[in-house]
């Protein structure tokens, strides 16, 4: 995700400041950079977020602010800040003529300019007149006061904060920040207005319909009557979390985002800071039957991003339109005529779908594993939510085939039992962005910052590609994949687990030149093999024979192609074991696999050999997946022969640990 | 030996089309990425469109997307940069570049379009 | 303006060495890999360096390429007076989706 991502409209300006005297003019050679949304029908040009770089202070930033007024005015321009960020970015937010950007760029701390633009409601219809009887009762959910002691903020439409399903449950703060509603002849209806909040506030917490019923809510006005918001209304919104935290800090801290807009580099950045912040953020993945990563908050990495499906598990088609899917969406769940409190009346219900009520039903979720485990940190909560989700249940054929890979098969679900998870070892899988065409182009794919890089992966749909390695950047191990000619592209695969307490280092070993291939172990005492890579600067792997065996009683080797450098993850943590499997199939076939036993985690997904006629590995849960070319096009027999390789670990630390406290 | 070579650039009025043409000889051309890149008079280099060696891949510059659309026939070993709604900031050598950024990066030796009333 | 900033000119003497920057930010340099060209007066660009520090056959070790986080250098020993050209830093940029090169330096060998 990243700021890497979204097919996103990015002016690139390189200005120096050589006009006005500036004194405190950027340092030669910085740029500041200019972003609007792709999506031309959302822009909002005339107003504009000005993002100061990270250490301005918030004088700065009021005085950065009155240096573009007073330059502008010199310029007869007439400009109005309309509010100044501090608390989780630096920054403000000023109306002004598009032809002052040139000028703005130029301030002294200027880091990005972001022109505002629109948010909408993610749900479908806006008003469905299918009123259910009221107090509807789902029988078969009741959980005891789920929930207690977790806040959830609604970031949505004002709502009917007197509605039985959660009166007394919700608190409507006094922050409203939203666009005047299109059309001339539009008449506000209270009704209306409050019907995609109340309906989401109830599905979270609501008496008879929500998921978290203990849960307690503050809502936010940041959409209009009509659904319509501001990635700037938004911005101001999350900053007035933060400070309401800041202020006067509660227990664990959910935020609800029912809301999408075009890819938003200043939407995202303040999630990314809320998130680090200790406040959980679950968004809907929109429903505009594309990518998620071409939206935000949805392509933020820090956020809990949630398509939806229906009944029977299938993802949810909204008319033309439908769930968004793609390596930005984190899990899948119920979005389909879900029923929830109507703003019709004060005992009526009504059902609404879409990705905002898929959204909704796991902030309920979280809410009810954060009141239960008060200390989780995101990343465990995230993994937490993958891991007692259901899997392989959504029919992948409803995505496009190349984002099916990509796309999450998990639909959410709570854990059987809110304590007795700590054992597990937790990991997930993190695709990169796709490289692009050109050989210059890598993939890179990150953890969470608490998250440990464990294994390393590549694919590319064509086979064109030079492997992948880890390494580190910024104090950290990234997965990289390498491009080869011919334009295809590539995707770097990361395993991101949860292991507290690691130490964990690559060992290289360089192209062995020679018949026996390249081999490299973790050689560190109580260091053990938790993934393999392969890398390889030639354009081709050509075939390798013989094949590579991995040697008996060597279980920490990483064995590859004799033109290829290995990289072995070691890593030392309390009570960490780990096993290699190999499934190697002798006949050409498209797809080989390989899985994990029950109590055991897949960390490593590898190929052997690392042949050009392997499009890759990736892990799928808990099972390693190799991918070759279509068995009409691949070779030889002995060619195609090619052997998938897992590595499996588990923790017998975190067992201990979580019978202790039982 | 790797050759290429552009042709259909000329004189065009703005609003007006183009299409430009890369024959490529001396190398199995489908196996590589091709892309077109120009440069205005007196100026620097500026990307303007990749396509991938099977065609199924395509990206664009921002300053023409919506306007120009490269395409290959790898049975005629030709590229293709179809350009409509010509502007005067157009104007420029329109190189023909195979697998820019690689070892196996080469070049033709350009086709000026011009765009003006 | 150009998403990768080089300087507009350098200049040396015959027989010295000169380095050319190229600095840019994450999502290009800091992640992709630096491509060198020359454009001689006239000409068409030529591949002086790949993958930030790979020569291909036929480029003398005259011309070196290194990079460190999100700048990249070109440097040349021994300078020449055909040495005098254009060149350009090129790379991926994955904000952008886009080849992005700096706006070239202009070599002037005294």
């Known amino acids: 995700q990243e700021d890497e991502d979204g097919d996103y409209e990015e002016l690139v300006l390189a200005l120096r400041s050589e006009e006005d005297g500036l004194a405190e003019a950027p340092e030669h050679g910085t740029t500041a950079t200019f972003h609007r949304c792709a999506k031309d029908p959302w822009r909002l040009p005339g107003t504009y977020v000005v993002v100061l770089k990270e250490e301005t202070h918030l004088s700065q930033s009021e005085r950065t602010a009155r240096r573009l007024q007073a330059q502008a005015a010199r310029r007869g321009y007439l400009t109005k800040i309309l509010h100044v960020f501090h608390g989780l970015l630096p920054g403000f937010l000023v109306k002004m003529s598009g032809d002052l950007l040139e000028l703005a760029l130029k301030l002294p701390h200027v880091d990005y300019i972001e022109e505002d633009s629109s948010v909408f409601a993610q749900s479908i219809p806006w008003n469905l007149e299918r009123i259910t009887p009221p107090r509807y009762r789902a029988d078969e959910y009741q959980p005891p006061d789920g929930g207690s002691l977790v806040e959830v903020y609604l970031l949505d439409t004002s709502i009917q904060s007197d509605h039985r399903e959660i009166e007394g449950r919700v608190m409507v703060t006094d922050f409203e920040n939203v666009p005047e509603e299109d059309g001339t002849r539009f008449h506000r209806q209270a009704s209306k207005c409050d019907s995609h909040g109340t309906h989401l506030a109830g599905v979270v917490s609501g008496r008879d319909a929500g998921v978290a019923k203990g849960a307690s809510m503050r809502s936010l006005r940041v959409l209009n009557c009509q659904g319509k918001g501001t990635v700037s209304g938004t911005l101001i919104g999350l900053e007035f979390i933060r400070k309401s935290q800041l202020v006067q800090p509660v227990g664990p801290l959910v935020v609800l985002l029912p809301l999408a807009g075009g890819y938003s580099r200043v939407l995202n950045a303040a999630c990314q800071r809320l998130a680090r912040a200790g406040v959980v953020l679950v968004t809907a993945a929109g429903n505009f039957r594309d990518d998620a990563c071409l939206y935000s908050p949805a392509s933020a990495p820090e956020v809990i991003t949630v398509g939806a499906t229906n009944a029977q598990d299938q993802p949810v088609t909204l008319g033309t339109l439908g769930t968004n899917f793609g390596r930005c969406v984190d899990l899948f769940a119920p979005g389909e005529d879900i029923i929830g409190a109507s703003s019709d009346c004060s005992t009526c219900f009504v059902s609404q779908s879409g990705t905002s009520q898929a959204a909704a039903h796991v902030a309920g979720i979280a809410a009810m594993m954060l009141s239960a485990e008060p200390e989780l940190t995101l990343a465990e909560l995230r993994q937490r939510l993958i891991h007692f989700s259901a899997k392989d249940v959504i029919n992948e054929a409803w995505f496009p085939e190349d984002q099916r890979v990509l796309t999450p098969n998990l639909v959410a679900a709570l854990p059987p039992s809110t304590h007795g998870a700590g054992w597990q070892l937790f990991c997930r899988t993190v695709w990169s962005a796709h490289s692009g065409p050109t050989r210059m182009a890598t993939a890179v794919a990150r953890c969470a910052p608490d998250e440990e890089l464990l294994s390393c992966s590549s694919f590319s749909r064509s086979g064109k590609r030079r492997g992948e390695r880890m390494e580190a950047q910024g104090g950290k191990l990234v997965c990289r994949a390498h491009n080869a000619f011919g334009g295809e592209g590539v995707y770097a695969i990361a395993r991101c687990c949860l292991l507290p307490q690691a130490n964990c280092s690559v060992h290289t070993a360089p192209p062995a030149e020679a018949s026996m291939g390249t081999r490299v172990h973790c050689h560190q005492q109580g260091h053990v093999l938790t993934g393999c890579s392969s890398h390889w600067e030639v354009e081709d792997l050509g075939t390798h024979k013989p094949p590579v065996l991995r040697p008996r009683g060597q279980p920490n080797q990483c064995v590859g192609h004799r033109e290829a450098s290995i990289h072995a993850s070691c890593c030392h943590a309390p009570g960490l074991e780990c096993k290699v499997k190999e499934h190697g199939i002798p006949a050409p076939q498209e797809q080989v696999t390989v899985a994990c036993e029950e109590g055991w985690t897949l960390t490593g997904c590898s190929a052997l050999p690392g042949t050009s006629h392997v499009l890759g590995a990736y892990a799928v849960d808990n099972t390693c997946v190799v991918r070759s070319r279509d068995v009409s096009t691949t070779g030889s027999t002995s060619e195609g022969a090619v052997t998938a390789v897992a590595i499996c670990c588990r923790s017998r630390h975190l067992a201990q640990a979580s019978q202790e406290l039982q | 030996e790797v050759q290429l070579l552009e042709s259909g650039g000329g004189l065009v009025q703005p609003g007006g089309s183009l299409r430009l043409s890369c024959a490529a000889s001396?190398?199995?051309?489908?196996?590589?990425?091709m892309s077109w890149v120009r440069q205005a008079p007196g100026k620097g280099l500026e990307w303007v469109s990749t396509i991938s060696g099977s065609g199924g891949r395509t990206y664009y510059a921002d300053s023409v997307k919506g306007r120009f659309t490269i395409s290959r026939d790898n049975s005629k070993n030709t590229l293709y940069l179809q350009m409509n709604s010509l502007r005067a900031e157009d104007t420029a050598v329109y190189y023909c570049?195979?697998?820019?950024?690689?070892?196996?990066?080469?070049w033709g030796q350009g086709t000026l379009v011009t765009v003006s009333s | 303006q150009s998403v990768l900033t080089q300087p507009p000119s350098v200049s040396a003497a015959p027989g010295q060495k000169v380095t050319i920057s190229c600095s840019g930010s994450n999502s290009n340099i800091g992640n992709n890999y630096v491509s060198w060209y020359q454009q001689l007066p006239g000409t068409a660009p030529k591949l002086l360096i790949y993958d930030n520090n790979k020569r291909p056959s036929g480029i003398p070790d005259r011309f070196s390429g290194s990079n460190s986080g999100t700048s990249a250098t070109l440097g040349i020993t021994g300078l020449q007076t055909g040495d005098e050209a254009d060149y350009y830093c090129g790379t991926w940029d994955s904000s952008l989706s886009a080849v992005v090169f700096g706006g070239g330096t202009k070599l002037t060998v005294l």
């Open positions: 570049a195979k697998e820019v950024g690689s070892p196996f990066d080469y």
């Open positions: 001396g190398f199995t051309f489908s196996s590589y990425a």
